[in-house]
């Protein structure tokens, strides 16, 4: 049973005579008269077991003391620390020729942990140990003892274990403590990589390459490696690990970001406070959740504040110019905290009687510079229909508008385009033809471009080729042309008039009057 004694972290103790409770029971040769186990009081008045020999009167001493078998535990080089006290031969009366002041240290490798006898020829000498000039004065009980400490190393070792032996050649000596240890580079964390306990190499100059493993919640950036030096010190750290998203380095560990903090990527950065208008409610957040009514665009970095869609544009002004409209407005009061504001124009064509019945304007309308994604606060809209009710909506949008399409983001204006000359009449028909008259009917122009005040019918005999024509005006979309000559070809043109003027004449309609009094009904463009 061993008591706990504190040694450096890079030393692993294989034997510590000071920690053994009770007798050490090492083997001495000769059994009597040589090394003897003795209890002394240590500095804490606790008994400790020591071995002493003081055969200083007789020459040619050869007293051996052998430890129990010491396991190697995979170490290739071990260190032996001996604390001993040596009595000065001058302090012993009448022993000048026979007293010595050194002893010898030996070892013997063996796989057998039960060797009962000391066979001197099996042992290999490590060194002759002498008391240093510099000794430590240690208080043993109430007396000052001159305590020497000597450390020797031996290796490379290959068998399961070994024995140590101490040969006395006539000194007055006590082994106060014998400690055998090997050196390791202790488990450590460097650059967020954990390196395991690593036994040093066999040579005093060897370096053992060790690959580290990333600590919990981290990942390799570059392969982490270190070298374990012979003295048990880690050398030359290479590579590193980075804390995963949601974690930061604290005390050599990757710890979860605290509530209210986040980390988006595996970097060496620390967790950052949640950006404005966002929060995290769990530890280990990789991003922060936007507050209600706030959003983050797809390409917004996690570090950016959460933002809102903008409020509606202000001060929308319209300027109608015939079938064109120029619109201008001011930026919204609240941009939502974003710089990427732009404007979209929505055009709706509305009925005069019921403005709520609106339809999209369609593709015939043109916008300058463009309809959507406007960066300026003005737009020119052309190719509108004349004398038509239009509602224009200007939508302020930014990168998060799509997440919250709210009508508050737009401002609208309703305008009526100016009247214009109507378009031509597409279809004119002869409804009834007699010897002396033709009854005509037609459709309203596709684009009246205002209120149709009247229609004008122009007709002439085909042979005259428009050199001599007559005009008939009517508010209706039909008329009877009378006083015609029988059996004569006539050409008819119809046009509409608004306050803005006449439109173009329709395509010619050729009709031939009859010779007999019967009625011929026609609906084509060229009745005969």
């Amino acid at each position: 049973v061993t008591g706990s004694r504190v040694y450096p972290a890079n030393e692993v103790t294989l034997l510590d005579s000071r920690s053994v409770q009770g007798e050490l029971g090492w083997i001495a040769s000769p059994l009597e008269g040589g090394w003897e186990e003795v209890s002394i009081m240590d500095e804490k008045n606790t008994p400790i077991r020591t071995y002493q020999v003081c055969n200083v009167m007789e020459p040619s001493q050869n007293n051996w003391l052998r430890t129990d078998w010491i396991t190697r535990e995979g170490a290739q080089r071990v260190y032996i620390e001996i604390k001993f006290t040596l009595r000065d031969c001058n302090s012993l009366p009448g022993v000048m020729g026979t007293c010595k002041e050194t002893f010898n240290l030996y070892y013997y490798e063996s796989d057998n942990d039960k060797e009962r006898f000391i066979r001197e020829n099996q042992f290999v000498k490590i060194d002759t140990i002498a008391a240093d000039e510099s000794f430590t004065q240690v208080d043993i009980g109430d007396r000052i003892m001159k305590l020497n400490t000597e450390i020797r190393d031996v290796g490379p070792l290959s068998k399961k274990g070994f024995y140590l032996a101490f040969q006395d050649v006539g000194a007055c000596i006590a082994l106060v403590s014998v400690r055998v240890f090997y050196k390791k580079c202790p488990l450590t964390v460097r650059n967020l990589a954990q390196f395991p306990d690593t036994i040093t190499g066999a040579d005093t100059s060897s370096l053992v390459e060790v690959r580290g493993s990333c600590v919990n919640n981290s990942e390799e950036k570059d392969v982490p490696k270190m070298y374990c030096g012979a003295d048990g010190e880690w050398l030359v750290p290479i590579g590193n690990c980075l804390c995963n998203a949601g974690h930061e380095e604290r005390s050599g560990e990757c710890q979860a970001c605290k509530i209210g903090y986040y980390k988006a990527l595996s970097t060496d950065a620390t967790c950052a406070k949640c950006p404005p208008h966002s929060y995290s409610v769990w530890e280990g957040a990789t991003s922060c959740t936007c507050d209600r009514g706030f959003f983050r665009a797809d390409n917004d970095a996690a570090s950016m504040p959460c933002t809102r869609p903008p409020s509606a544009p202000l001060n929308l002004i319209s300027n109608v110019n015939e079938t064109s409209v120029n619109l201008e407005w001011s930026s919204p009061q609240n941009t939502g905290g974003r710089q990427d504001i732009s404007y979209n124009v929505v055009c709706k064509k509305c009925g005069a009687g019921d403005p709520s019945k609106c339809r999209p304007c369609g593709s015939g309308v043109h916008y300058t510079p463009q309809q959507n994604g406007l960066k300026t606060t003005k737009v020119s809209i052309t190719d509108l229909l004349a004398h038509t009710n239009y509602t224009f909506e200007i939508w302020a949008v930014n990168g998060v508008s799509k997440y919250n399409p709210n009508p508050d983001q737009s401002v609208s204006v309703t305008v009526t385009t100016n009247q214009a000359a109507p378009s031509s009449i597409a279809l004119v028909q002869a409804k009834e033809v007699t010897r002396y008259s033709v009854a005509l009917a037609w459709l309203e122009p596709d684009r009246p471009n205002g209120v149709i005040l009247e229609y004008e019918v122009k007709y002439y005999e085909k042979d005259q080729n428009e050199r001599s024509y007559r005009i008939v005006r009517t508010a209706a979309r039909n008329t009877d042309i009378k006083g015609l000559n029988p059996l004569t070809s006539y050409v008819f043109h119809v046009r509409a008039r608004t306050a803005a003027g006449y439109g173009d004449f329709s395509e010619p309609l050729e009709v031939t009057t009859n010779t007999v009094p019967s009625r011929i009904i026609g609906d084509g463009a060229n009745s005969t």
Epitope: E32, G33, V38, I40, M41, Q52, C54, N55, V56, M57, E58, P59, T85, L86, R87, L92, P93, G94, V95, T98, I140, G141, D142, R143, M145, C172, I173, A174
Partner: antibody
């Protein structure tokens, strides 16, 4: 086991001599010094001196020079105390004791059973 | 010559009690002091040497301390076989004993 064997009691007349043997066994005789201690009846212990069993070199305490001689016969592992010109005040038990030198200090770790020398006319 | 004075001359204790014996030197003897036990009709027995180191086979109820001029031998719990006379002895260039302390049954 280690032991020191002394002879039985001696009765001597004043002026006579006595030689008290101390035979050692159980260890190498020449490896340990031998000390002599006197204890008068009802009194305490008195150290007389010691002899180096390897060299034969004796050391005498104050008051034990002249009439007291330490000697050896290493062939039989025996130390001797010889007292000449005995006086009545020499009446005492005489102990031989093996001297133990150690790093930590010295002491007499093995004692003979003692020889009572009585000096009486 | 260094004179050792032991006190008390007689110490009366009951078995199981603690006994403390004192030895004072007329000048410093460093740690060069030993303690012996002597029972009637027997040779002395070495208990302690080097002021505090147990001799072989001595039970650990015996302990000793001190250096220089003041030394103490303590028997933590006196057993029946511990009733005896106890001597201190210094070993410098010349050795001397104290006059002894008798430990008797109370």
């Amino acid at each position: 086991q280690v032991q020191l064997l002394q002879s039985g009691a001696e009765v001597k007349k004043p002026g006579a001599s006595v030689k008290v043997p101390c035979k050692a066994s159980g260890y190498t005789f020449t490896s340990r010094a031998m000390s002599w201690v006197r204890q008068a009846p009802g009194q305490g212990l008195e150290w007389m001196g010691w002899i180096n069993t390897n060299t034969g070199n004796p050391t005498y305490a104050q008051g034990f020079t002249g009439r007291f001689v330490f000697s050896l016969d290493t062939s039989v592992s025996t130390a001797y105390l010889q007292i000449s010109s005995l006086k009545a005040e020499d009446t005492a038990v005489y102990y031989c004791a093996r001297v133990r030198f150690t790093v930590y200090g010295d002491g007499m770790d093995v004692w003979g059973q003692g020889t009572l020398v009585t000096v009486s006319s | 010559e260094i004179v050792l004075t032991q006190s008390p001359a007689t110490l009366s204790v009951s078995p199981g009690e603690r006994a403390t014996l004192s030895c004072r030197a007329s000048q410093s003897v460093s740690s060069n002091l030993a303690w012996y036990q002597q029972k009637p009709g027997q040779a002395p027995r070495l208990l302690i040497y080097g002021a505090s180191t147990w001799a072989t086979g001595i039970p650990d109820r015996f302990s000793a301390s001190g250096s220089g001029t003041d030394f103490t031998l303590t028997i933590s719990r006196v057993e029946p076989e511990d009733f005896a006379v106890y001597y201190c002895q210094q070993y410098g260039p010349s050795w001397t004993f104290g006059q002894g302390t008798k430990v008797e049954i109370k």
